[in-house]
C-alpha cells in the first residue's frame, strides 16, 4: 500500500490496532523491515507499507482526520470529500474525522443528503455498520450531539464555535462519498439546532446532547420538525432526568404554528402535546445547577407522525367466523365525568362506521379500527353461550373455556369474558376443571392475580353467586347442579402476559341434587380459605353445598370455623352441617340455627363438609367461612 498526503492538506492518517480479538496470530504493519502496530502519516508524507497477515481488517483500523480551520481564513464550504479516496486506502474499518474550528459568532451547518440520519442511543448499533458521530464545542469542552445511522429524518445540524464529525465505515462498505456538506450561517445563539424532516408517516427518537450523560448546564438545544400539513405529530418523552436547579427552571418550549400562546412551555414531567398539524419546534432549556449537587438533565423523546386519527389505517381483524352464540362488545369504560374537554374515542367497523361502542357477533370476520387518543379509555366484554339441548349427546362432553387469541391481540383491554353454560333441567349437571387449581377469593386471602373466574347461577330466578376464583389455590374442581355463567374478569394489563395461566374445562355430567360441590386438595404449604356461596347475601333458602376435602396419607387436616355461631335464624326448616369421614363414613351433624359451631377439629383422612340451609328470616342469613390446614402426621394412627 502507498499513502501520499498532499502538503497543506491538514490530513493525518493513523492506522492502529482495533479492539483486541481472540485471534491466535498477531498481525503487523511492515514498513522498511520493521513490524509495528501503529502507523501515523502526516500532511506531505508518502509512505509505502504492507501487512504481515492476510486479513488486516481483523486487526487494524484506520482513522483519517482532516482539520478545517475557519479561524484564520475562509472556510472551505460545500460538499465534503472523502480524502484520500477510499479506493486508495487499505480495506480496514475506516473513520473519517472532520474537525472544524470556528469563531463563537459563526454558525456552522451540516447538511445531510438523502438518506437522512437516524439517532441511536447508547448500546445501539447501525444495521449497515455506518455511523456518524457528531460533537460540538463549548469553549474547550467537547459536547456530544449524538450518534446517528442512515435512513432517518435528521437533515441538518447547526452548531457554532466548531464541529467534529466522525464517519465510521466498515471495511467492506463500498461508500465513497461523505454524504454531507458544510455551510456557514449566522450565530444560532444556542448549543445546536437539529432539523428533522418527515416526508410521510414515521417516528424519530432523539436525545439531548451528551445523552445518557448530563446536558450542559444552562444550555439551549432546539429540534425543528418539518411535517407535511396533512399529517399530525405527537411528542412523547421516553426517558428524562431533571437536575437540581439553583436558578431558572428546566423546561421544554414548543413553537407550534397557529398557536396563540407561542412559545408553549411545558415541564418535562407534563404530558407533551400531540396531534400537532404541520411544522413545529421543540427546545430544551437547562438551568443554573446547584454546584454541590448538580444532578443531570437528560431527555430521550419520540416524535410520532401519522395521519390524523380520523384517517387511521391500522386495521384489526377479529375472526368470529368459527364461533357460535358469541358477542363481543367494545365500549367506553366507566369514568367520572370531568368538565374538561376530552377528545372523542371511537371504534370503527370497516374503517367507516364509527361509534363509541361496537358489538360484534359470531359467524363472521370483522375488520375494526380505532379513532382514539388513548385506547385505555375503552374495554371489551365478551359473552359466549355453550348449551346442551340433548342430554344423550352431551353427556361427558367437554369444552375448553379459553379467550380466543384474536381477541387477546386487540389493543383494547379485555374486561369480562363470560361463558353461559346451559344444561337440560334435571337431566345433566356441570363440572369445571381448571388447568391450575383455584383459590377462592376471601378477605383473609384475597386473589392478587391479573384475572379471576366469577362463577354464578345463570337461572334467572336464582340469586346464587358461587364466588370469585383465581389460579394458584387448592380447588381442583367445581361441580354445579344447573345453568351457570363463568366470567373471566381481568384486573390488570398484565393479563396479556398471564393469559397462558387461564384454562378451564367444562364437562356435562350426570345430574345431581346439590347446588354445588367443591373438590379441594390442599397443599401442605398454605392455609385454604373456603366460604359459602353468596357471601354477604347469605346462602339461598333450602340450598345445599358440599366440600370434598382430600387429606394425604402422611398429613392431618385441621378444620377451623371463623365464628362461634352461624348466625342464621330459620323461618321454616332446619339449617345443618354434616362433617363426614369418607373412609369410615362416621359423621357429626351440627344444627346451624341452634348449636355452637365446632371447635377446630383434626382429620386424618379425606372428609366431606356439607352445609344445607333452611328458609331463613330476612337479615339472619347463613354465611360461613372456614379454613383447612395440613400438617405432617406425627404419630401413625392407622
Amino acid at each position: 500500500f502507498e499513502i501520499a498526503l498532499p502538503r497543506e492538506s491538514n490530513i493525518t492518517v493513523l492506522i492502529k490496532l482495533g479492539t483486541p480479538t481472540l485471534l491466535a496470530k498477531p498481525c503487523y504493519i511492515v514498513i522498511s523491515k520493521r513490524h509495528i502496530t501503529m502507523l501515523s502519516i502526516k500532511s506531505g508524507e508518502r509512505i509505502v507499507f504492507t501487512f504481515s497477515c492476510q486479513s488486516p481488517e481483523n486487526h487494524f483500523v484506520i482513522e483519517i482526520q482532516k482539520n478545517i480551520d475557519c479561524m484564520s481564513g475562509p472556510c472551505p464550504f460545500g460538499e465534503v470529500q472523502l480524502q484520500p479516496s477510499t479506493s486508495l486506502l487499505p480495506t480496514l474499518n475506516r473513520t473519517f474525522i472532520w474537525d472544524v474550528k470556528a469563531h463563537k459568532s459563526i454558525g456552522l451547518e451540516l447538511q445531510f443528503s438523502i438518506p437522512r440520519l437516524r439517532q441511536i442511543g447508547p448500546g445501539e448499533s447501525c444495521p449497515d455498520g455506518v455511523t456518524h458521530s457528531i460533537s460540538g464545542r463549548i469553549d474547550a469542552t467537547v459536547v456530544r450531539i449524538g450518534t446517528f445511522c442512515s435512513n432517518g429524518t435528521v437533515s441538518r445540524i447547526k452548531m457554532q464555535e466548531g464541529v467534529k464529525m466522525a464517519l465510521h465505515l466498515p471495511w467492506f462498505h463500498p461508500r465513497n462519498v461523505s454524504g454531507f456538506s458544510i455551510a456557514n450561517r449566522s450565530s444560532i445563539k444556542r448549543l445546536c439546532i437539529i432539523e428533522s424532516v418527515f416526508e410521510g408517516e414515521g417516528s424519530a427518537t432523539l436525545m439531548s446532547a451528551n445523552y445518557p450523560e448530563g446536558f450542559p448546564e444552562d444550555e439551549l438545544m432546539t429540534w425543528q420538525f418539518v411535517v407535511p400539513a396533512h399529517l399530525r405529530a405527537s411528542v412523547s418523552f421516553l426517558n428524562f432526568n431533571l437536575s437540581n436547579c439553583e436558578r431558572k427552571e428546566e423546561r421544554v418550549e414548543y413553537y407550534i404554528p397557529g398557536s396563540t400562546t407561542n412559545p408553549e412551555v411545558f415541564k418535562l414531567e407534563d404530558k407533551q402535546p400531540g396531534n400537532m398539524a404541520g411544522n413545529f419546534n421543540l427546545s430544551l432549556q437547562g438551568c443554573d445547577q446547584d454546584a454541590q449537587s448538580p444532578g443531570i438533565l437528560r431527555l430521550q423523546f419520540q416524535v410520532l407522525v401519522q395521519h390524523p386519527q380520523n384517517e387511521s389505517n391500522k386495521i384489526y381483524v377479529v375472526d368470529l367466523s368459527n364461533e357460535r352464540a358469541m358477542s363481543l362488545t367494545i365500549e367506553p369504560r366507566p369514568v367520572k365525568q370531568s368538565r374538561k374537554f376530552v377528545p372523542g374515542c371511537f371504534v370503527c367497523l370497516e374503517s367507516r362506521t364509527c361509534s363509541s361502542n361496537l358489538t360484534l357477533t359470531s359467524g363472521s370476520k370483522h375488520k375494526i379500527s380505532f379513532l382514539c387518543d388513548d385506547l385505555t379509555r375503552l374495554w371489551m366484554n365478551v359473552e359466549k353461550t355453550i348449551s346442551c339441548t340433548d342430554h344423550r349427546y352431551c353427556q361427558r362432553k367437554s369444552y375448553s373455556l379459553q379467550v380466543p387469541s384474536d381477541i387477546l391481540h386487540l389493543p383494547v383491554e379485555l374486561h369480562d369474558f363470560s361463558w353461559k353454560l346451559l344444561v337440560p333441567k334435571d337431566r345433566l349437571s356441570l363440572v369445571l376443571v381448571p388447568a391450575q387449581k383455584l383459590q377462592q377469593h376471601t378477605h383473609e386471602k384475597p386473589c392478587n392475580t391479573s384475572f379471576s373466574y366469577l362463577v354464578a347461577s345463570a337461572i334467572p330466578s336464582q340469586d346464587l353467586y358461587f364466588g370469585s376464583f383465581c389460579p394458584g389455590g387448592s380447588i381442583k374442581q367445581i361441580q354445579v347442579k344447573q345453568n351457570i355463567s363463568v366470567t373471566l374478569r381481568t384486573f390488570a394489563p398484565s393479563f396479556q402476559q398471564e393469559a397462558s395461566r387461564q384454562g378451564l374445562t367444562v364437562s356435562f355430567i350426570p345430574y345431581f341434587k346439590e347446588e354445588g360441590v367443591f373438590t379441594v386438595t390442599p397443599d401442605t404449604k398454605s392455609k385454604v380459605y373456603l366460604r359459602t356461596p353468596n357471601w354477604d347475601r347469605g346462602l339461598p333458602s333450602l340450598t345445599s353445598v358440599s366440600w370434598n376435602i382430600s387429606v394425604p396419607r402422611d398429613q392431618v387436616a385441621c378444620l377451623t370455623f371463623f365464628k362461634e355461631r352461624s348466625g342464621v335464624v330459620c323461618q321454616t326448616g332446619r339449617a345443618f352441617m354434616i362433617i363426614q369421614e369418607q373412609r369410615t363414613r362416621a359423621e357429626e351433624i351440627f344444627s346451624l340455627d341452634e348449636d355452637v359451631l365446632p371447635k377446630p377439629s383434626f382429620h386424618h383422612h379425606s372428609f366431606w363438609v356439607n352445609i344445607s340451609n333452611c328458609s331463613p328470616t330476612s337479615g339472619k342469613q347463613l354465611d360461613l367461612l372456614f379454613s383447612v390446614t395440613l400438617t405432617p402426621r406425627t404419630v401413625d394412627l392407622t
Epitope: Y28, S32, K33, S40
Partner: antibody
C-alpha cells in the same frame, strides 16, 4: 523458550579472520519480521552494533566496519554467522548475538563470547 | 549517523528514591508515529536485558518501577522507587536509521 549461544575462538592474532557462530532455539529465522544482530562490548566501553540479518536474508552493516564484516545464516540449522577480517587489538571485546523480533529492539541476548586479539 | 548522548554518565541514588536517566539523539528517532528508542540494563558479566521498547512500552517480566517517556530527540528512563538490585549500567538504543546506535551508558549506583 528462546535461547541464543555464541561461540568463537577466544584468542586471535592480529590480521587473522574472526569467525563467530550464534546457535539459537525457540524461534525461527524464517518468521516474518525476525532478525539477529551481532553487538560487541569492549571492556570498559559501551555497546556497539555490528550487523543484522533479516528473515528474508536482507543484511545491514555498521558503515564504520562494513568492509570487514560478513553476516550470514543457516535457517535450517538455526545458526547465524559473523566474519570479521583483519582483526587487531581494537577488536578485543565480548561479542553478543541478539534476537530482534520486529526489526528494531533486541529482546533476547546470548551470554556473549570473549575475543582477545594479541600478538 | 544518529549519535545518542546519555546523561549523566553515572549517578548515585538512595534506596527507594527516584532515578532519572536521559538520552538525547542528534536527530529525531520518530517515524510514522512510533519512537524507535529502547532501553537496556546490563550488569557485570551478564548480557544486556531489554527494559523498555519503543520509548514507553514495558517489556514483559520487567517490574513496573521502570518507565520510559519521550519522543523525537529527548527520552527518559525513570526508576521509581530504586531497589538495590537496580545497580547496573543502562543503555539507550535507536534503530530509526542505519547504523543502529547505542548511547554511551549510565552507571547507576545505589547509596
Amino acid at each position: 523458550e528462546v535461547q541464543l549461544q555464541e561461540s568463537g575462538p577466544g584468542i586471535l592474532q592480529p590480521s587473522q579472520t574472526l569467525s563467530l557462530t550464534c546457535s539459537f532455539s525457540g524461534f525461527s529465522l524464517s518468521t516474518s519480521g525476525m532478525g539477529v544482530s551481532w553487538i560487541r562490548k569492549p571492556s570498559g566501553k559501551g555497546l556497539e552494533w555490528l550487523a543484522h540479518i533479516f528473515w528474508d536474508d536482507d543484511k545491514r552493516y555498521n558503515p564504520s566496519l562494513k568492509s570487514r564484516l560478513t553476516i550470514s545464516k543457516d535457517t535450517s540449522s538455526n545458526q547465524v554467522f559473523l566474519m570479521i577480517t583483519s582483526v587487531d587489538t581494537a577488536d578485543t571485546a565480548t561479542y553478543y548475538c541478539a534476537r530482534s523480533p520486529y526489526g528494531d529492539y533486541f529482546d533476547y541476548w546470548g551470554q556473549g563470547t570473549t575475543l582477545t586479539v594479541s600478538s | 549517523k544518529i549519535v545518542l548522548t546519555q546523561s549523566p554518565a553515572s549517578l548515585a541514588v538512595s534506596l527507594r528514591q527516584r532515578a532519572t536517566i536521559s538520552c538525547r539523539a542528534s536527530e529525531s528517532v520518530d517515524s510514522y508515529g512510533n519512537s524507535f528508542m529502547h532501553w537496556y540494563q546490563q550488569k557485570p558479566g551478564q548480557p544486556p536485558k531489554l527494559l523498555i521498547y519503543r520509548a514507553s512500552n514495558l517489556e514483559s517480566g520487567v517490574p513496573a518501577r521502570f518507565s520510559g517517556s519521550g519522543s523525537r530527540t529527548d527520552f527518559t528512563l525513570t526508576i521509581d522507587p530504586v531497589e538495590a538490585d537496580d545497580a547496573a549500567t543502562y543503555y539507550c538504543q535507536q534503530n530509526n536509521e542505519d547504523p543502529w546506535t547505542f548511547g554511551g551508558g549510565t552507571k547507576l549506583e545505589i547509596k
